[in-house]
């Protein structure tokens, strides 16, 4: 799925409200020197690629994360706040029901909420190199296409 | 517990440079964004620039390019901020801070780091 | 760069009243507007994020509201430690930008 058209602002307030909580209670009583963040990315509809991938797509090490609190409202939030993505998830959301039945916290599953954590800290503030133009969100408070 | 810990006060000539330092401690250094910000005598905030510390991207505000230079060394959690140029305008307390968890605000700061210049 | 102007400079509270800082930006901001707290000889430090979202511990009686240009800040019932320079900080576009401060003192 091409995340280019999602609306960026939107998804932000979600994550804001309500999905950044239920990330922080699941990582709940983690030291924050445990896990050093190696998955990034450069602009918004990469960040979204990547969080999909990390939030949907079982692991080894870690099945289970499809069935949290915060994987449900994300994937609410990309339904209702990007283009089409509902209908590119019909397949994808039954092998994740195949996937699993049970929700298993693992150091694994820690470390990739870990991940994700970082990835929506960069989707809600890209840190982008300058060339020119020192802005890093398009006039209209929807769509992000510099590359820099 | 989070700590950022800046460098003792410095005194500078006009034209020459000047290196603070912002060691942190408490979390992950890597994985939060280091931003650094200055306010002059009885002066209001004014943001210098920001680092990734983990793959070394910069963003600057545009009053300081060319001048600031913003650096980080994974190996001792530590972050730098270079000025050079130095002029009296530049007499101001240097703080560094870190983003907190949304990437929305700056929830740490350091204590500050005075900077004179003078002749 | 977006120019963010508080108003009023400076004001004088009886504690137990209330106070209202505001913020205007230049131009639209969406919701990415933060509030700071700079005690006398302290560092800033953070209290409301996104507009409305209060930073761990800081006390209910702070406030924020507002969208696109127009933002708020405010205090149910002032009390003697909420003395010091309230800063409203947009970080929608780079250079972020802070407003020049708001001065509150206890009467």
């Known amino acids: 799925y091409d995340f280019t058209n999602c609306d960026f602002e939107k998804i932000k307030a979600a994550y804001l409200s309500t999905i950044s909580k239920d990330l922080i209670t699941y990582m709940s009583g983690t030291k924050s020197t445990e896990f050093n963040n190696t998955v990034s990315c450069s602009n918004r509809p990469h960040c979204l690629t990547e969080i999909q991938s990390l939030t949907f797509n079982p692991t080894a090490g870690c099945a289970s994360l499809a069935k949290e609190m915060f994987a449900m409202k994300t994937k609410a939030a990309l339904a209702i706040w990007c283009p089409g993505y509902s209908e590119t998830q019909i397949n994808a959301t039954q092998a994740m029901k195949k996937a699993r039945k049970s929700k298993v916290t693992t150091n694994k599953c820690l470390e990739q909420v870990s991940q994700l954590q970082g990835l929506w800290r960069r989707f809600n503030r890209p840190l982008l190199k300058q060339q020119g133009s020192s802005d890093y969100k398009d006039d209209d408070d929807k769509h992000h296409h510099h590359h820099h | 517990e989070v700590q950022l810990v800046q460098s003792g006060a410095e005194v500078k000539k006009p034209g020459s440079s000047v290196k603070v330092s912002c060691k942190a401690s408490?979390?992950?250094?890597?994985?939060?964004?280091i931003e650094w910000v200055r306010q002059a005598p009885g002066q209001g905030l004014e943001w210098i620039g920001v680092i990734d510390p983990g793959n070394g991207d910069t963003n600057y505000n545009e009053n300081f390019k060319g001048r600031a230079t913003l650096t980080a060394d994974k190996s001792t959690s530590t972050a730098y901020m270079e000025l050079s140029s130095l002029r009296s305008e530049d007499t101001a307390v240097y703080y560094c801070?870190?983003?907190?968890?949304?990437?929305?605000?700056?929830?740490?700061w350091g204590q500050g780091t005075t900077v004179t210049v003078s002749s | 760069s977006i120019v963010m102007t508080q108003t009023p400079l400076s004001l004088s509270v009886t504690p137990g009243q209330p106070a209202s800082i505001s913020c205007k930006a230049s131009q639209s901001v969406s919701s990415d507007v933060t509030w700071y707290l700079q005690k006398p000889g302290q560092s800033p430090q953070l209290l409301i994020y996104y507009v409305s979202n209060h930073y761990t511990g800081v006390p209910d009686r702070f406030s924020g509201s507002g969208y696109g240009t127009d933002f708020t800040l405010k205090i149910s019932r002032v009390e003697a430690e909420d003395v010091g320079v309230y800063y409203c900080q947009q970080h929608h576009r780079f250079p972020l930008t802070f407003g020049q401060g708001t001065k509150l003192e206890i009467k």
């Open positions: 408490g979390y992950a250094f890597s994985n939060y964004l």
């Open positions: 801070a870190r983003e907190d968890n949304t990437g929305t605000a700056f929830d740490y």
